[in-house]
Interface confidence: low
């Protein structure tokens, strides 16, 4: 190579490759006819110099054009994040259709695809049991009501509490845990003032699951003096 | 640049950089004086052509030399994995000392450091309650005994069951869930044959947590006919 050619030295930088994640709809949205379930596609680690990413959505490999894509947002680490939500039909999810998000950009070496669908397998309805506070807890100001939800499949479930018919807020659900037979269980714990329990108020554990008749069941619990 | 210069195009390859992960000791090892808690450092994605990695360990920034480093092992993808375990003093972990693993190699652009320590905050002992099977479950062949462990901090906890003094196996623990006040709770569910429950066998929920006196407590449960 002649000396005056001016060939530039190679400077190789490690490319930051964006990651794509796909998220299922919320179980409650899938099982409540008045709500709209959505599959969500999130692209992270987008460089500020990258062009906008393009989202394409497919239901059982047929392209659909009903997604809502938000403008990308800057994150604290100076990268960007882009989100696209696809409203879906309740029955499409329940019937096991596949939802595919394809993400492309001039900055990507190839499109990135992520697919999601409902867990395969025959639905099994949960058994729901309400459990009053343990006797030893009655020495405290706050007591815990427990809802034990067992033997369900798949793991997608919604557990909520009502108190005298109104939504209760001070509850926490565990993540679904798999039993040895492949079914799942969950516990939900509602903390209430002991005085509210002893006053005989009714507390209701409400469960949404696709295996249930009408996708819904509930079990109530109240203090019976003398017990 | 003249046309006949013959400058070579730049071909950049993405370097495979090793990753380092650090893992805490098991809660049971930390809280059982006859066991040895260990902090573990794992290096993955080591190329077969790379020299051995060197591990250095520091406790509160003071170098220690008691680690056991295993010979590197080949993985299925033709990369290697190297593991170093540092046996630690129970009290050092409980007192919040920082454990640092530094990994270096002639193939690395710089040493890689990972640090771990116990979750900060004042320990709070769990409240442990055992709950018999719900009455409605007694129609089934198998019933569920529940251990509710509440209001503890930090989240590191071990929950096990014994049956007439022998370790039980058919139990599952939920992952610790944070209460609104920053403490944690866990449920453990032991499935037993109804006949074993009705026979009056004693089932014991055993809990190890640093906030407990002697780091241990247990609560027993058995069927009382007529209840």
């Amino acid at each position: 190579v002649p000396r005056d050619c001016g060939c530039k030295p190679c400077i190789c930088t490690v490319p930051e490759v964006s990651s794509v994640f796909i998220f299922p709809p919320k179980p409650k949205d899938v099982l409540t006819i008045t709500l709209t379930p959505k599959v969500t596609c999130v692209v992270v680690d987008i460089s500020k110099d990258d062009p906008e990413v393009q989202f394409s959505w497919f239901v059982d490999d047929v392209e659909v054009h009903t997604a809502q894509t938000q403008p990308r947002e800057e994150q604290f680490n100076s990268t960007f994040r882009s989100v696209s939500e696809l409203p879906i039909m309740h029955q499409d999810w329940l019937n096991g259709k596949e939802f595919k998000c394809r993400v492309n950009s001039a900055a990507f070496p190839a499109p990135i695809e992520k697919t999601i669908s409902k867990t395969k397998g025959r639905p099994k309805a949960p058994q729901v049991y309400t459990i009053p506070p343990p006797k030893e807890q009655m020495a405290k100001d706050k007591v815990s009501l427990t809802c034990m939800i067992t033997d369900f499949f798949p793991e997608d479930i919604t557990v909520e509490w009502q108190w005298n018919g109104q939504p209760a807020e001070n509850y926490k659900n565990t993540q679904p845990i798999m039993n040895t037979n492949g079914s799942y269980f969950v516990y939900s714990k509602l903390n209430v003032q002991k005085s509210n329990w002893e006053a005989g108020n009714t507390f209701t554990c409400s469960v949404l699951h696709e295996g249930l008749h009408n996708h819904h069941t509930e079990k109530s619990l109240s203090h019976s003096p003398g017990k | 640049v003249p046309r006949d210069c013959g400058c070579k195009p730049c071909i950049c390859t993405v370097p495979e950089v090793s990753s380092v992960f650090i893992f805490p000791p098991k809660p049971k090892d930390v809280l059982t004086i006859t066991l040895t808690p260990k902090v573990t450092c794992v290096v993955v994605d080591i190329s077969k052509d790379d020299p051995e990695v060197q591990f250095s360990w520091f406790v509160d920034d003071v170098e220690v030399h008691t680690a056991q480093t295993q010979p590197r092992e080949e993985q299925f993808n033709s990369t290697f994995r190297s593991v170093s375990e540092l046996p630690i003093m129970h009290q050092d972990w409980l007192n919040g000392k920082e454990f640092k693993c530094r990994v270096n190699s002639a193939a690395f652009p710089a040493p890689i450091e990972k640090t771990i320590s116990k979750t900060k905050g004042r320990p709070k002992a769990p409240q442990v309650y055992t709950i018999p099977p719900p009455k409605e479950q007694m129609a089934k062949d198998k019933v569920s005994l529940t251990c509710m462990i509440t209001d503890f901090f930090p989240e590191d906890i071990t929950v096990e069951w014994q049956w007439n003094g022998q370790p039980a196996e058919n139990y599952k623990n939920t992952q610790p869930i944070m209460n609104t006040n920053g403490s944690y709770f866990v449920y453990s569910k032991l499935n037993v044959q109804k006949s074993n429950w009705e026979a009056g066998n004693t089932f014991t929920c055993s809990v190890l947590h640093e906030g407990l006196h002697n780091h241990h407590t247990e609560k027993s449960l058995s069927h009382s006919p007529g209840k």
Epitope: F21, I22, K114, E155, Q175, P176, I177, M178, Y184 | F21, F23, P24, K26, P27, K28, D29, T40, V42, V44, R81, V83, D156, I157, T158, V159, E160, K172, N173, T174, Q175
Partner: nanobody, 125 residues
Framework: QVQLVESGGGLVQPGGSLRLSCVVS????????IGWFRQAPGKEREAVSC????????NYADSVKGRFTISRDNAKSTAYLQMNSLEPEDTAVYYC??????????????????WGQGTQVTVSS
């Protein structure tokens, strides 16, 4: 959402071998324990083997001990089940499952909450 995809199933003669693979995507594999489960026609799903996130501990069902070997390669986001000395009773759909690593010391493959769609293994002459 973590996704798992199994491969490597097929038809094999008794005494033969197969190696199943499970590719995990949508999450950091190092954060999960991996289990292999199987379901034979008309039977309940059963655990076959599992391995902790750092490959340090493994568990096997009694029926496969000494014949099956579980392993994982976090760098490749892949878990494996090497099945040797296969028997007709091993015929089933084999599922891979991921569980978040649990620091409780006595449970080596707890609480799977992500599943693959399964791969068929048939052992027949």
């Amino acid at each position: 959402q973590v996704q798992l995809v199994e491969s490597g199933g097929g038809l094999v003669q008794p005494g033969g071998s197969l190696r199943l693979s499970c590719v995990v995507s949508g999450g950091t594999m190092n954060a999960y324990a991996i289990g292999w489960f199987r379901q034979a026609p008309g039977k309940e799903r059963e655990a076959v083997s599992c391995i902790t996130s750092n490959s340090k501990y493994t568990n096997y069902a009694d029926s496969v001990k000494g014949r099956f070997t579980i392993s994982r390669d976090n760098a490749k986001s892949t878990a494996y089940l090497q099945m040797n000395s296969l028997e007709p009773e091993d015929t089933a759909v084999y599922y891979c499952a991921a569980a978040q690593f649990f620091n409780d010391g006595h449970q080596y493959c707890p609480n799977p909450n992500y599943w693959g769609q399964g791969t068929q293994v048939t052992v027949s002459s």
